[in-house]
């Protein structure tokens, strides 16, 4: 409940909020969980704590890990966890699932796309917006405050939208990008029994002990907007939330994408600092809609290193 996934790209700013509710006047102490080492509050540090916020200015891949925040009120101390993953910049235009924020849906009447997490940053308008990595141009697109409005939305407008803005901290500027999928509600839709695209059933994925790994559960459910279409991960037949291991988290938002006109939903299971015991678990990708439930199982195995003489 009080563990939150956050992610960003190297050399960009990342600001994370402690997942515990409280007043701005409360003292919040931040620690790097693995070492219990306190995060400094001095702003001259690249990574520093500022009340409920933890700031990476800019972030590095090595910053990935679990951070503990302790919110100290006059009456109680409350603990939360921020599970931070910093990824290398992608060389091509493709934005992988694990960097995507929750999907938004639009129609002719309502086509607002909000820039995710922007409220945490000190930014000034205007935002820059890109679709599938191309800068948006033309009078149909209006960047307004923290969101993009698209006039006369068409099915072609579905896709991945990236907002880019500058965070300012003490006169220094840092770039931030965030991407989310936009789907267009299609009245002429239909639904099918779920088809799981990934993982393949009874697949085995090789992983390195101590490294992070991501498992994507992806399924298609029909064409157009779906009344009920959900994908989720289970561990040994149990919900992720019932499995009290903060290293293993399912991303909050489910990303919706369209493949050949089909409505497909993805969710990513993030496993930090893979341990031997993770290899013993059964990971089930579940896809559910009104037609029924489909399940694909994947297991993890230790990566074999081939030594050539």
């Amino acid at each position: 409940k009080f563990s939150k996934q956050s992610w960003g790209l190297e050399n960009e700013a990342l600001i994370v909020r402690c997942p515990r509710q409280g007043k701005s006047s409360y003292i919040v102490d931040w620690y790097y969980s693995q070492t219990n080492k306190s995060i400094p509050t001095q702003e001259r540090n690249r990574v520093f704590a500022s009340g409920q916020l933890l700031k990476f200015l800019p972030a590095e891949v090595a910053d990935s890990g679990i951070y503990t925040c302790i919110v100290r009120s006059p009456t109680f101390n409350r603990t939360g966890y921020a599970n931070v993953t910093i990824y290398k910049k992608q060389p091509d235009c493709n934005v992988p699932d694990y960097l995507m924020y929750s999907t938004v849906s639009g129609s002719e009447k309502n086509s607002k796309i909000y820039c995710p997490t922007i409220d945490l940053y000190n930014w000034t308008a205007p935002l820059e917006w890109f679709k599938n990595c191309q800068a948006l141009q033309g009078s149909r697109y209006k960047a307004h405050k923290s969101f993009l409005v698209i006039d006369n939305v068409m099915t072609d407008d579905a896709g991945d939208y990236t907002c880019k803005f500058i965070h300012n901290e003490n006169g220094a500027n840092y770039s931030v990008t965030a991407t989310r999928s936009f789907t267009v509600k299609d009245e002429q839709g239909f639904s099918l029994f779920p088809v799981i695209r990934a993982p393949a059933h009874n697949e085995t994925k090789e992983v390195e002990i101590g490294e992070n790994t991501n498992l994507t559960c992806s399924a298609c459910f029909g064409k157009g907007a779906q009344f009920l279409a959900t994908v989720q991960w289970q561990l040994n037949g149990n919900k992720i939330t019932d499995f009290s291991e903060p290293r293993i988290q399912q991303e909050e938002g489910q990303n919706q994408s369209f493949s050949n006109g089909l409505a497909c939903v993805n969710t990513v299971l993030r496993i930090a600092d893979v341990k031997e015991e993770d290899l013993l678990l059964r990971y089930d990708c579940l896809a559910l809609n009104l037609h029924g439930l489909r399940r694909h199982t994947i297991r993890l195995s230790r990566k074999h290193h081939h030594h050539h003489h």
Partner: antibody, heavy 117, light 106 residues
């Protein structure tokens, strides 16, 4: 030592309103949250809601959304609970309690509200 | 809305005996549960906060355990001064009290 002072009792007519007060000593109420809890005679505890006195933000349990109004005056270090359209169901002891967002630690002695004609 | 089912409604024990009270929630709330004691004519008193944390000054005969949806509050070697009503409180989603358990001595 933190103390929360509440009036002992209120007798009110059905259909009327009542405003209960809770004054803190040795503690600045704007530094934490003030919760209100209802306890009917020989019954259990019911959480009414919480207020952040510093900024006036409130959150109510769905059951009390239309019944209760929480306010606070930081200058007098006092929190208030107003109950409207009173019926016999509102006859209860009402506690104020200081705490954080998630729980209460310091409690007042409670105000007994009796609704009777 | 998260609901809490507390049991038993009442129990009677002899001094020195062990008391066990259970609360079950309808949703997974991790360990965000608190335990209160209320003696007749007094306001409730917080004994145990979330994460099974004993509050300062509370005797070690009181303890709690549980995670997810199933929680247990225990009094080892019950004393006569422990006669009271006991309530669990979940604060994962809004705040909800259990219905309470009345503890009496035989």
């Amino acid at each position: 030592e933190v103390q929360l002072q509440q009036s002992v009792a209120e007798l009110v007519r059905p259909g009327a309103s009542v405003k209960l007060s809770c004054t803190a000593s040795a503690f600045n109420i704007k530094d934490d949250y003030m919760h209100w809890v209802k306890q009917r005679p020989e019954q259990g505890l019911e959480w009414i809601g919480r207020i952040d006195p510093a900024i006036g933000n409130t959150e109510y349990a769905p059951k009390f959304q239309d019944k209760a109004t929480m306010t606070a005056d930081t200058s007098s270090n006092t929190a208030y609970l107003q109950l409207s359209s009173l019926t016999s169901e509102d006859t209860a002891v009402y506690y104020c309690a200081l705490g954080d967002f998630y729980a209460m630690d310091y409690w007042g002695q409670g105000t007994s509200v009796t609704v009777s004609s | 809305e998260t609901t809490v089912t507390q049991s038993p409604a009442s129990l009677s024990v002899a001094t020195g005996e062990k008391v066990t009270i259970r609360c079950i929630t309808n949703t997974d709330i991790d360990d965000v549960i608190h335990w209160y004691q209320q003696k007749p004519g007094e306001p409730p008193k917080l004994l145990i906060s979330e994460g099974n944390t004993l509050r300062p000054g509370v005797p070690s005969r009181f303890s709690s355990s549980g995670y997810g949806t199933d929680f247990v509050f225990t009094i080892e070697n019950t004393l006569s001064e422990d006669v009271a009503d006991y309530y669990c409180l979940q604060s994962d989603n809004m705040l909800t009290f259990g219905a309470g358990t009345k503890l009496e001595l035989k």
